[in-house]
Interface confidence: medium
């Protein structure tokens, strides 16, 4: 088993809005939950927009999820990680 | 389950600070979500604010964002809520409680402690 | 913000009796996600409150079935089979789907 490293960037989006991304790579299985979590509950699947999970060409895997949230209203939004029994959690940056 | 053991009552002066603790064991810390809430003597609850003891983010109730401030102590497991500009309003029982998103995806003060009493008098 | 109202105010019951609790939300509390985020809590005198429902209908670990949840949109209900001594106190409900999160009122259930 190769645990995902992740890593969570920002963008603009339209006015008063911001896109959140959300990136795995280098993990091994294949499988992977990775969501976007807002006061701990994760979002519904037609607010986030998900990468393919695909190889990087080392043997291991990558993908992403991203979403669109108020700007302001980024501590309130953290990316969830599970993968191989492990989970983790990953803030929005400010 | 778990534990969440509150500090004791407070008699303090308006106008000056308080810092109340949670201090928890038998969970993971760093994965849970801790809120604190607000009961006057026979009165509802008011939802304060959350902190998520894994990044320290948090999540204030409007009506409270200038009267408290969350933190946590990861090392000793404990969250804290320091309340300051005390007035005689402010005068009530305070709780800690964790989420349980993991286990019922979706319960929001599932483990309570057992309150801390804030008496606010000249 | 989101107003919680419970009815009644206090509810007078006879052990054994079925007990029924309202609670109406000024606006309808679907999250974003789907979920609808409502739960009841009980507090005993002197005690913190127990979470005995989540998700409008589910019991939380250790509820006795006697207790159960419905509802949708703006309009919940608890209802208690039978009602037990250990059943009293006052109960409350919450919303958990628009910050800030809100409890309504409260309704004493008491015996009669």
């Known amino acids: 088993t190769v645990p995902p490293m992740v890593n969570v960037t920002r963008s603009e989006a339209s006015e008063g809005n911001i896109t959140v991304t959300c990136r795995a790579s280098s993990f091994y299985p294949r499988n992977i939950i990775l969501t976007w979590r807002q006061d701990g509950v994760s979002l519904s699947h037609d607010t986030q927009q998900w990468g393919d999970v695909l190889p990087d060409g080392n043997g291991t895997y990558q993908t992403w999820v991203a979403t669109r949230i108020c700007a302001g209203e980024e501590q309130r939004f953290t990316c969830y990680m599970e993968h191989s029994g492990n989970h983790s959690t990953h803030p929005v940056p400010s | 389950q778990g534990q969440m053991q509150q500090s004791g009552a407070e008699l303090v002066k308006p106008g000056a600070s308080v810092k109340l603790s949670c201090k928890t064991s038998?969970?993971?810390?760093?994965?849970?979500?801790i809120s604190w809430l607000k009961q006057k003597p026979g009165q509802s609850l008011e939802w304060i604010a959350w902190i998520y003891a894994g990044t320290g983010g948090t999540s204030y109730n409007q009506k409270f964002t200038a009267k408290a401030q969350l933190t946590v102590d990861t090392s000793s497991s404990t969250a804290y809520m320091q309340f300051s500009s005390l007035t005689t309003e402010d005068s009530a029982i305070y709780y800690c409680a964790r989420h349980d998103y993991y286990g019922t995806s979706g319960a929001w003060f599932a483990y309570w402690g057992q309150g801390t009493l804030v008496t606010v008098s000249a | 913000d989101v107003l919680m109202t419970q009815t009644p105010l206090s509810l007078p019951v006879s052990l054994g009796d079925q007990a029924s609790l309202s609670c109406r939300s000024s606006?309808?509390?679907?999250?974003?996600?789907?979920?609808?985020?409502l739960e009841w809590y009980l507090q005993k005198p002197g005690q913190s409150p127990k979470l005995l429902i989540y998700k409008v209908s589910n019991r939380f670990s250790g509820v006795p079935d006697r207790f159960s949840g419905s509802g949708s949109g703006t309009d919940f209900t608890l209802k208690i089979s039978r009602v037990e001594a250990e059943d009293l106190g006052v109960y409350y409900c919450?919303?958990?789907?628009?910050?800030?999160?809100?409890f309504g009122g409260g309704t004493k259930v008491e015996i009669k």
């Open positions: 038998g969970f993971t810390f760093s994965d849970n979500y």
């Open positions: 919450f919303q958990g789907s628009h910050v800030p999160w809100t």
């Open positions: 606006q309808n509390i679907v999250h974003i996600n789907g979920n609808t985020y």
